[in-house]
């Protein structure tokens, strides 16, 4: 039985489609292709006589169609108006013609989408971020990618507006990264350039690492005191130190050479992030023994204040 196969069935606008004829009868002498589901002289695209290899255009010929000796019809630079049914009539020597109908669907060529964001530098636990994939295209599927992966399942991630909008509720630091949207229809797909989400966070409660020279578990008079403060923060926090409440340097490491019992007291590391408007601190009490005893370092309660 004569059949028509469309390759591809779903065609992107501007591309080409090939209508392939299968199971052609042996005693064929010519072909006619028609636009639509029936043979109608007004819908004739092209006729072909096998003996002379002569193709004759019909009223529905657009100049984009090519008929081949095997009855296949190539349509180039397709438009959405080309969507629909196409009928092949095979003319036989016994004049008992055979007909078969095939179809294809033309989808619009998808534009390269772009992402707009209401906030590309949100503050952790404070801001929500809405990404919108533009433009809006009818009969199109919208997909989102984060760091090259499909969206993770999370109650903080919401898709709306036909998946055109991705909302991150109460953004977290691990939401930072590269966001892309992709639009798809059955014929093609197109992906946006990535947009980087930079989550501002911290400073977290700092930690103080004692680096003692010489390396020892205790603070003996004459040793070097080397305290390093660290806090997770984006952007990096500004560090500052206070000893017994007196402001010191603005460095991450506090170094005091050859400590004595006069250096006893509370050592506080303060961290500040202007971008999040938050501060934090930690206090350690340090005692230095005059001779052989080894009191060491003890951690005081840390306190942090949010502005």
């Amino acid at each position: 039985k004569l059949t028509i196969e469309s390759t591809p069935f779903n065609v992107a606008e501007g591309k080409e489609v090939l209508l392939l004829a299968h199971n052609l009868p042996q005693n064929r002498i010519g072909y006619s292709w028609y636009k639509g589901e029936r043979v109608d002289g007004n819908s004739l695209i092209v006729g072909y006589v096998i003996g002379t290899q002569q193709a004759t255009p019909g009223p529905a010929y657009s100049g984009r169609e090519t008929i081949y000796p095997n009855a296949s019809l190539l349509i180039q630079n397709v438009t959405q108006n080309d969507t629909g049914f196409y009928t092949l009539q095979v003319i036989k020597s016994d004049l008992v013609n055979e007909e078969a109908t095939g179809q294809f669907h033309v989808y619009p060529e998808l534009p390269k989408p772009s992402i707009s964001s209401n906030n590309s530098n949100p503050v952790e636990d404070k801001d929500a971020v809405a990404f919108t994939c533009e433009p809006e295209v009818q009969n199109t599927t919208y997909l989102w990618w984060v760091n090259g992966q499909s969206l993770p399942v999370s109650p903080r991630l919401q898709l709306s507006n036909g998946n055109m909008t991705l909302t991150l509720l109460s953004v977290k630091r691990n939401d930072a990264g590269s966001y892309e949207c992709e639009i798809q229809n059955p014929a093609s797909a197109n992906r946006s350039d990535p947009v980087t989400l930079n989550v501002l966070y911290g400073p977290d409660v700092p930690t103080i690492s004692p680096i003692i020279s010489p390396p020892d578990s205790s603070y003996l008079s004459g040793a070097n005191l080397n305290l390093s403060c660290h806090s997770a923060s984006n952007p990096s926090p500004q560090y500052s130190w206070r000893i017994n409440g007196i402001p010191q340097q603005h460095t991450q490491v506090l170094f005091i050479a050859k400590i004595t019992p006069n250096n006893n007291g509370t050592y506080a590391c303060f961290v500040s992030n202007l971008a999040t408007g938050r501060n934090n601190s930690i206090v350690k009490s340090i005692t230095v023994s005059a001779s052989g005893t080894s009191p060491g370092l003890s951690a005081g309660a840390h306190h942090h204040h949010h502005h």
Epitope: N121, P235, Q238, T251, Q252, V253, L274, A275
Partner: antibody
Framework: QVQLVQSGAEVKKPGASVKVSCKAS????????LHWVRQAPGQGLEWIGY????????NYAQKFQGRVTMTRDTSTSTVYMELSSLRSEDTAVYYC?????????????WGQGTLVTVSS | DIQMTQSPSSLSASVGDRVTITCRAS??????LAWYQQKPGKVPKLLIY???NLVEGVPSRFSGSGSGTDFTLTISSLQPEDVATYYC?????????FGQGTKVEIK
């Protein structure tokens, strides 16, 4: 007191290199990052890059990458800035300056400046 | 890179006048903004950091304000020794960039 003392003026020909030194004193050398900034005659300030004296890590402005090298000698508390393939528009006063603290602080102490003249 | 735009490029005022210099950043600086004073033939001197923090030893007639992208340096009562060029600079990450400078003169 904190001091940054730079090497003396230099006159160089186009295509040559210049190496300017900056000796730090009055504070713990490895605790503060050191930046280089230049100022062409009658012009504004232009940031070149910085070096972390503790680790030797450097960060250069895009404009100078490939032409600038910053190094340090912790034994003498000195940092160096070498600029190669000199051209006339590199004529400027080159300053070393200490960052006020670590991370996102401005520059609180500056060297006296070194005039580099590039002329054929 | 972040662009810093200062205005005016120069100004002339009388002793005792209130003087205002503005600086606009091309992106949000979250308050990481410093001001420097450079007197003729001298090295730049840090006056203010974090938008409004006055460096120790700087006279209280200098003050800073602003947020986001717009910042201001104010001299409440201009003195003869304030004749200088003033530069703003963002200090949120590198590359650091400076404004083009504002030259302050006495009428």
């Amino acid at each position: 007191q904190v001091q940054l003392v730079q090497s003396g003026a230099e006159v160089k020909k186009p295509g040559a290199s210049v190496k300017v030194s900056c000796k730090a004193s009055g504070y713990i050398f490895t605790s503060y990052w050191l930046h280089w900034v230049r100022q062409a005659p009658g012009q504004g300030l232009e940031w070149i890059g910085y070096i972390n004296p503790q680790t030797g890590y450097t960060n250069y402005a895009q404009k100078f990458q490939g032409r600038v090298t910053m190094t340090r000698d912790t034994s003498t508390s000195t940092v160096y800035m070498e600029l190669s393939s000199l051209r006339s528009e590199d004529t400027a006063v080159y300053y070393c300056a200490r960052e006020y603290g670590n991370y996102n602080y401005p520059l609180d102490y500056w060297g006296q400046g070194t005039l580099v003249t590039v002329s054929s | 890179d972040i662009q810093m735009t200062q205005s005016p490029s120069s100004l002339s005022a009388s002793v005792g006048d209130r003087v205002t210099i503005t600086c606009r950043a091309s992106e949000n600086q979250y308050g990481y903004l410093a001001w420097y004073q450079q007197k003729p033939g001298k090295v730049p001197k840090l006056l203010i950091y974090n938008t409004k923090n006055l460096v120790e030893g700087v006279p209280s007639r200098f003050s800073g304000s602003g947020s986001g992208t717009d910042f201001t340096l104010t001299i409440s009562s201009l003195q003869p020794e304030d004749v200088a060029t003033y530069y703003c600079q963002h200090h949120l990450g590198t590359p650091y960039t400076f404004g083009q400078g504002t030259k302050v003169e006495i009428k």
